[in-house]
């Protein structure tokens, strides 16, 4: 029943070119190259892509032509290794080119940079963008793919094609509108925010596969698909999990052509078999390919079947538990996870995985005991505290969010996380805490039954950002420990961290707290980031500062910015009042 059983093809590149079509082929090769060589200029990538495309066309014409039988990794790697400035631009990455496949591709993958040293993307004026769009639509869209791909080296490539399609549609519509800006800017903001979220979600999938292995990803997929398709049989869910794992393994491994092709096949299979999968797929399956795949990935959970039997019968009360477990451990645990998840759309995936792990640990212990049944009879009682912990945490934090609002809630998290892991860089702490804080507006509005899956699974995505950024330049053993010990226990691990008592406070540097008139022209978001950066620095200088002390200083700081931005001579105001503020803050905090 596997979707992806294919006949052997003489030429893999010809096969993928024919399957995907020229437009998608070129777009995906561009994404792949930009994700590998993140510093290369756009023009260089376009040149490489055109060369690969021309070569692919010769293979389509004659699959026996020279080099057409080579693997895609070999072809693409050879092409990347022709870049003249490889050593100057990328340093040791150039050493990858001395290796043979598959080691060469693995080497390129290891050099992907989650935080590349690239300038922030500045959005030009709407008229400038519309002119560029009309002058050369193809180049304009390629540039979009290139800029996103190089900044997000794990972005889910077939999904990026969908974003590009929406990007094009926005310009096509809005550049003809009476008020171009009013039409276009909200659409671009939405694409930017959705894009960041999509990138972060995919980054977690790749981290799951690369750091914790296929079994961890499959467990995640079983839980999520069982929640989404509770009417589907276990065999059907297992088949979808196997195919989905293949798709994501390919994309995370840089095999973007295979990934996009297989994702299309999977969408086709799901739509052909929707009667045995979910009643919610009808609308998705009427859409064109890119929209269809996106829609399936986001589809709401189907209704749970009526009359689902007690889980305890098969997994606790049955005398055959240990026999079934011993015969096929992963299948039995998979069935447990499937049955539990389809009954609990109100649980986060990570909670379901924790329950499955607890169940597995219990069986490992009890099936070797003198009386296994007596030993595992109370296993479900062990689940209660595991369920209550995230429920309580979400309740408390949603109450705090409703009391403070998003900005101040983010600030509370900034303080909390800086005290936990003060060694982490300030930009990372600001970025991660701001994202953690967004859980409030994203999830607290939901009813109880939807809060936990929304909140805890979102937090997993955000904490993974912290983990991948920290992995690049590790500075905290506590972060390393929480990030590497258990994928599903990352959030509880970070939640359990107390103030780091071993941290030696940072030396006070007045320059850190010197502000200029340019802050007045910043957007509200940028101004918040400036203030939050200062807050993190304050905590790093004075980790034992109380909430009240920090609040007083931050209130003074906000008043100072507001006052100086209203002043006639802003720069003088910032210089003079700034000195006073620094002195007052030092006094207030006892620095």
């Amino acid at each position: 029943r596997g979707v992806f059983r294919r006949d052997a093809h003489k030429s893999e590149v010809a096969h993928r070119f024919k399957d995907l079509g020229e437009e998608n082929f070129k777009a995906l090769v561009l994404i792949a190259f930009a994700q590998y060589l993140q510093q290369c200029p756009f023009e260089d990538h376009v040149k490489l892509v055109n060369e690969v495309t021309e070569f692919a066309k010769t293979c389509v014409a004659d699959e026996s032509a020279e080099n057409c039988d080579k693997s895609l990794h070999t072809l693409f790697g050879d092409k990347l290794c022709t870049v003249a400035t490889l050593r100057e631009t990328y340093g040791e990455m150039a050493d990858c080119c001395a290796k043979q496949e598959p080691e060469r591709n693995e080497c390129f993958l290891q050099h992907k940079d989650d935080n590349p040293n690239l300038p922030r993307l500045v959005r030009p004026e709407v008229d400038v963008m519309c002119t560029a769009f009309h002058d050369n639509e193809e180049t304009f869209l390629k540039k979009y793919l290139y800029e996103i791909a190089r900044r997000h080296p794990y972005f889910y490539a077939p999904e990026l094609l969908f974003f590009a399609k929406r990007y094009k549609a926005a310009f096509t519509e809005c550049c003809q509108a009476a008020d171009k800006a009013a039409c276009l800017l909200p659409k671009l903001d939405e694409l930017r925010d959705e894009g960041k979220a999509s990138s972060a979600k995919q980054r977690l999938k790749c981290a799951s596969l690369q750091k914790f292995g296929e079994r961890a990803f499959k467990a995640w997929a079983v839980a999520r698909l069982s929640q989404r398709f509770p009417k589907a049989e276990f065999a059907e869910v297992s088949k979808l999990v196997t195919d989905l794992t293949k798709v994501h393994t390919e994309c995370c491994h840089g095999d973007l052509l295979e990934c996009a092709d297989d994702r299309a096949d999977l969408a086709k299979y799901i739509c052909e078999n929707q009667d045995s999968i979910s009643s919610k797929l009808k609308e998705c399956c009427e859409k064109p390919l890119l929209e269809k795949s996106h829609c399936i990935a986001e589809v709401e959970n189907d209704e749970m079947p009526a009359d689902l039997p007690s889980l305890a019968a098969d997994f606790v009360e049955s005398k055959d538990v240990c026999k079934n477990y011993a015969e096929a451990k992963d299948v039995f645990l998979g069935m447990f996870l499937y049955e539990y998840a389809r009954r609990h759309p109100d649980y986060s995936v990570v909670l379901l995985l924790r329950l499955a792990k607890t169940y597995e640990t219990t069986l490992e212990k009890c099936c070797a005991a003198a009386d296994p049944h007596e030993c595992y009879a109370k296993v479900f009682d062990e689940f209660k505290p595991l369920v209550e912990e995230p429920q309580n945490l979400i309740k408390q934090n949603c109450e705090l969010f409703e009391q403070l609002g998003e900005y101040k809630f983010q600030n509370a998290l900034l303080v909390r996380y800086t005290k936990k892991v003060p060694q982490v860089s300030t930009p990372t702490l600001v970025e991660v805490s701001r994202n953690l804080g967004k859980v409030g507006s994203k999830c607290c509005k939901h009813p109880e039954a939807k809060r936990m899956p929304c909140a805890e699974d979102y937090l997993s995505v955000v904490l993974n950002q912290l983990c991948v950024l920290h992995e690049k330049t590790p500075v905290s053993d506590r972060v390393t420990k929480c990030c590497t010990e258990s994928l599903v226990n990352r959030r509880p691990c970070f939640s359990a961290l107390e103030v780091d008592e071993t941290y030696v406070p940072k030396e006070f540097n007045a320059e850190t707290f010197t502000f200029h008139a340019d802050i007045c022209t910043l957007s509200e978001k940028e101004r918040q980031i400036k203030k939050q950066t200062a807050l993190v620095e304050l905590v790093k200088h004075k980790p034992k500062a109380t909430k009240e002390q920090l609040k007083a200083v931050m209130d003074d700081f906000a008043a100072f910015v507001e006052k100086c931005c209203k002043a006639d001579d802003k720069e003088t105001c910032f210089a003079e009042e700034g000195k006073k503020l620094v002195a007052a803050s030092q006094a207030a905090l006892g620095l």
């Epitope: 276990f234 009359d307 039997p309 305890a312 019968a313 098969d314 049955s318 055959d320 026999k323 069935m335």
Partner: antibody, heavy 121, light 111 residues
């Protein structure tokens, strides 16, 4: 009324296949394990196997490979697929409801009337 | 395979008699008590009398009782009634659900 009704029996040639159905009424099949037991004319009861509430199947060693039990909770029906039938498979086939949900306790407290299967050329 | 041996294979008795049928398994039943007794009349399916060695099934008269543990079990009818003439089977549940087994029956007839 709470009852089980078997159907699908009849005359079949040796080597042939047959699928028996057991429809439940008056209760939901999803709350108990469901077993199949057969009885050759004038002979003892013989356990074939059982399907648990979650779909786990367990078969007597002699039945493994030739006989398959399945269930469709939406139809409130349990099935027994029999392949490679032999003359010695001639019997009345009963479906029965076990006291347990996840395994076979051997205590079947509700039985159907049975359906006769005759394997003969 | 696990064997369930019933004795006697046939038995004649009169109304009002106390009757005892035994069942022996070649292995201990699960939890030492997973043993059931059935009554079957011609042309009818079996009817559960006793489960878990000694528990009376719903609607079964109290003259029926069961005892035993491990491998040896007994069904007793304290005072035989006319409707009790039938064939009686024991069935054992073992550590695996695949091993459930029936005895070959004891036919109880009128003396």
């Amino acid at each position: 009324e709470v009852q089980l009704v078997e159907s699908g029996g009849g005359l079949v040639q040796p080597g042939g296949s047959l699928r028996l159905s057991c429809a439940a009424s008056g209760f939901s099949l999803s709350s108990n394990a469901m077993g199949w037991v057969r009885q050759a004319p004038g002979k003892c009861l013989e356990y074939i196997g059982i399907i648990s509430v979650g779909g786990f199947t367990y078969y007597a060693s002699w039945a493994k490979g030739r006989f398959t039990i399945s269930r469709d909770n939406s139809k409130n029906t349990v099935y027994l697929q029999m392949n490679s039938l032999r003359a010695e498979d001639t019997a009345t086939y009963f479906c029965a409801r076990d006291r347990h949900g996840g395994d076979s306790s051997g205590a079947f407290y509700l039985w159907g009337q049975g359906t006769l299967v005759t394997v003969s050329s | 395979d696990i064997q369930m041996t019933q004795s006697p294979s046939s038995l004649s008795a009169s109304v009002g008699d106390r009757v005892t049928i035994t069942c022996q398994s070649s292995e201990s039943v699960y939890s030492n008590n997973q043993l059931s007794w059935y009554q079957q009349k011609p042309g009818q399916p079996p009817k559960l009398l006793i489960y878990d060695a000694s528990d009376l099934a719903s609607g079964v008269p109290s003259r029926f009782s069961g005892s035993g543990s491990g491998t040896d079990f007994t069904l007793t009818i304290s005072s035989l009634q006319p409707e009790d003439f039938a064939t009686y089977y024991c069935a054992g549940g073992f550590s695996s659900s695949s091993d459930t087994a029936f005895g070959c029956g004891t036919k109880l007839t009128v003396l």
